[in-house]
């Protein structure tokens, strides 16, 4: 009778094992082991027992002990079971961004690993088991479907193998794949809203706003704003599930014409885009040309208005005849024209919009000086000791300087409140002077005062003065 010990062995792949072959007869003709494995016999006393070291055990094997005894031949098998953890445990690659609501198939592939009967494949989200199946096939493949939800954003999915050798007195061997981090997103089907001027003038700045609602996660959304080839640099403001991107756009003469304004929102592996056309135009203000901005009264003045070749102008409210970019008017400058504004309004149609530009020039008419009865009365009669304000207004441009002098030496305080004394009486020569010339006007001031009649105790001086036509003024004595 042949026996083997141990009859069952579980060992790691590539490992070694001692196998003892025994026989029941004392003097066996033959005692040995049959195995393809490398073997080494360990010498022991006696003839009925042999110990072999079997090494580099790579796969399950059934070495067989045999003996030839006088009563016959017999054999005994030992069962070597090799265990090893899988060489590859991995999740099939997936795009990191997944839209919410999509069915996501997780596929785990396991290569190697034994004994397969003890090998299980587990699919996990975080630590939560999604599916557990025995490893079947080579490679073994386990799949599960997940409906992508918002709250899956940032979740880690992984695959784990469990080689459970605890019933054989060993431990539980686990192998885990590299995690797959899921990024979930919501990008609405509606395109972004783009608000911008339809027309934009050369050398000006416009504001472009691009916005979109219903995004998740909004902070991950990328916004690209561009006008033609010009990338804009927006300032982005985020809401809970919305954003608003605001950018300033400057345009130059090179941009003139129709340009495409684009706003693209990229989230995950999807994008939404809105296109709009912006017409960039050049429209300088019309030019108002006066033959001379400052002219003397009576001068012929030509006022011209010139604008963009495609514009239509009106000069002081009168449309050009024929309707077009030029208008002019002729006038003879009068004092009433001083300070008169000549306004040219030009209208240009750009992409269906009417653009208006204005330019105003003022005409200065030099005239005067003037002194007339209405504004500088020639005669004043005032009671003595009353408060009066002599008024005399000189007209002209530039405004004349006015001085009223009696005898070239006594000024009349024009526009000042004065106490009327006999001193004030007399004829004043009012002179208005400016760069345009000089005019004079005589102004007489009469002072009403009761005459001294003389009488007892009187000096009689008044009689002498009256007779000689001499008047006494408080400060001056002179002949009338």
């Amino acid at each position: 009778q042949t026996s083997v010990s141990p009859s069952k062995v579980i060992l790691p792949r590539g490992g070694s094992v001692l196998v003892t072959c025994s026989t029941s007869c004392d003097q066996p003709k033959l005692l040995g082991i049959e195995t393809p494995l490398p073997k080494k016999e360990l010498l022991l006393p006696g003839n009925n027992r042999k110990v072999y070291e079997l090494s580099n055990v790579q796969e399950d094997s059934q070495p067989m002990c045999y003996s030839n005894c006088p009563d016959g031949q017999s054999t005994a098998k030992t069962f070597l079971t090799v265990y090893w953890t899988p060489e590859r445990v991995e999740l099939a690659p997936l795009p990191s961004w997944q839209p919410v609501g999509k069915n996501l198939t997780l596929r785990c592939q396991v290569e190697g690993g034994a004994p397969r009967a003890n090998l299980t494949v587990v699919l996990l989200r975080g630590e939560k088991e999604l599916k557990r199946e025995p490893a079947v096939g080579e490679p073994a493949e386990v799949t599960t479907t997940v409906l992508v939800r918002r709250d899956h954003h940032g979740a880690n999915f992984s695959c784990r193998t469990e080689l459970d050798l605890r019933p054989q007195g060993l431990e539980l061997f686990e192998n885990t794949s590299a995690p797959y981090q899921l990024q979930t997103f919501v990008l609405p089907a509606t395109p972004p809203q783009l608000v911008s001027p339809r027309v934009l003038e050369v050398d000006t700045q416009g504001t472009v706003v691009c916005s979109l609602d219903g995004l998740f996660p909004v902070s991950e959304a990328q916004v690209h704003l561009a006008l033609g080839d010009q990338r804009l640099n927006p300032t982005v403001t985020y809401g809970n599930d919305s954003f608003s991107a605001k950018a300033s756009v400057s345009v130059t003469a090179e941009d003139e014409g129709t340009q495409r304004l684009t706003c693209a929102v990229i989230l995950g592996n999807q994008s939404q885009e809105t296109l709009q056309t912006v017409t960039i135009y050049s429209f300088p203000a019309p030019n108002v040309i006066l033959t001379k901005p400052e002219v003397s009264e009576g001068t012929e003045v030509t006022v011209k208005c010139e604008a963009h070749p495609r514009a239509k102008v009106t000069l002081n409210g009168v449309p050009a005849q024929p309707l077009g970019p030029r208008a002019q008017l002729l006038l003879k400058a009068t004092p009433e024209d001083n300070g008169r504004s000549f306004s040219c309004s030009a209208t240009l149609e750009v992409a269906g919009q009417l653009i208006h530009k204005n330019q105003t020039r003022e005409l200065r008419v030099l005239y005067g000086p003037r002194l007339d009865e209405r504004d500088c009365p020639g005669n004043w009669t005032w009671p003595e000791n009353s408060q009066q304000t002599p008024m005399c207004q000189a007209w002209g441009n530039p405004l004349p300087e006015l001085k009223c002098l009696k005898d070239g030496t006594f000024p009349l305080p024009i526009g000042e409140s004065v106490t009327v004394t006999r001193d004030l009486e007399g004829t004043y020569l009012c002179r208005a002077r400016s760069t345009q010339g000089e005019v004079t006007r005589k102004v007489t001031v009469n002072v009403l005062s009761p005459r001294y009649e003389g009488g007892s105790g009187g000096s009689g001086l008044n009689d002498i003065f009256e007779a000689q036509k001499i008047e006494w003024h408080e400060e001056n004595l002179y002949f009338q």
Partner: antibody, heavy 117, light 110 residues
């Protein structure tokens, strides 16, 4: 347009001296003319004025001692019985009371009168 | 009488400094006031008329102000050439007055 004084020099106290102001480039019929003096180390002192109508006006201290008169092109200042106090530079000035700016107010260069025995 | 009182009699100023000269009339002369600059051996130079109007060719650093009885001449950013005696003159009344001119203010520029 210019004004120039003449007639200054040495005069004995109690004598008589007449200074003449000759004008050119304007008419005396439309301008007032005045006389101002400055004694050595003293300030400007107003003497009097003759108006465009030939009327005369004097400082209170000058009445009776000074007489201003004019012809078509000259204005005279007569000093009666001068004293050493009257030693000064005498200036003739056009329109001293007119406040127009004619580029500058016309003053003569002045003439020095020395009263000494 | 329209007597003119000028203060101070003398003032010292550094180049670039500011000088203020005051002139007071004994009764209102409205705005009829002129200012003169007088240097030894030279005729008076007309600076300001009607209290605040600058005569032709006068630098803008000279400024006149006031009306009625109180008047001021201000020299801002004084220059060495501004060293002179300055006089105010009332141009309102020519009769029965002691002097149409103020007593003068000597300006020394250091």
């Amino acid at each position: 347009q210019s004004v120039e004084e003449s007639g200054g020099g040495l005069v004995k106290p109690g004598g008589t001296l007449t200074l003449t102001c000759t004008v050119s480039g304007f008419s005396l019929s439309s301008h007032a003319m005045g006389w101002v003096r400055q004694a050595p180390g003293k300030g400007l002192e107003y003497i009097g004025i003759i108006g465009s109508s030939d009327r005369t006006y004097y400082a209170s201290w000058a009445k009776g001692r000074f007489t201003i008169s004019k012809t078509s092109t000259t204005v005279d200042l007569k000093i009666t019985s001068p004293t050493t106090e009257d030693t000064a530079t005498y200036f003739c000035v056009r329109d001293p009371y007119d406040s127009y700016d004619d580029g500058y107010r016309l003053w003569g260069p002045g003439t020095l009168v020395t009263v000494s025995s | 009488a329209y007597d003119m009182t000028q203060t101070p009699a003398s003032v010292e100023v550094a180049v670039g400094g500011t000088v203020t000269i005051k002139c007071q009339a004994s009764q209102s002369i409205y705005r009829y006031l002129s200012w003169y600059q007088k240097k030894p051996g030279q005729r008076p130079k007309f600076l300001i008329y009607d209290a605040s109007k600058l005569a032709s060719g006068v630098p803008s650093r000279f400024e006149g102000s006031g009306s009625g009885t109180e008047f001021t001449l201000t020299i801002s950013g004084a220059q060495s050439d501004d060293a002179a005696t300055y006089y105010c003159q009332q141009a309102y009344s020519s009769g029965s007055i002691d002097n149409a001119f103020g007593g003068g203010t000597e300006v020394v520029v250091k």
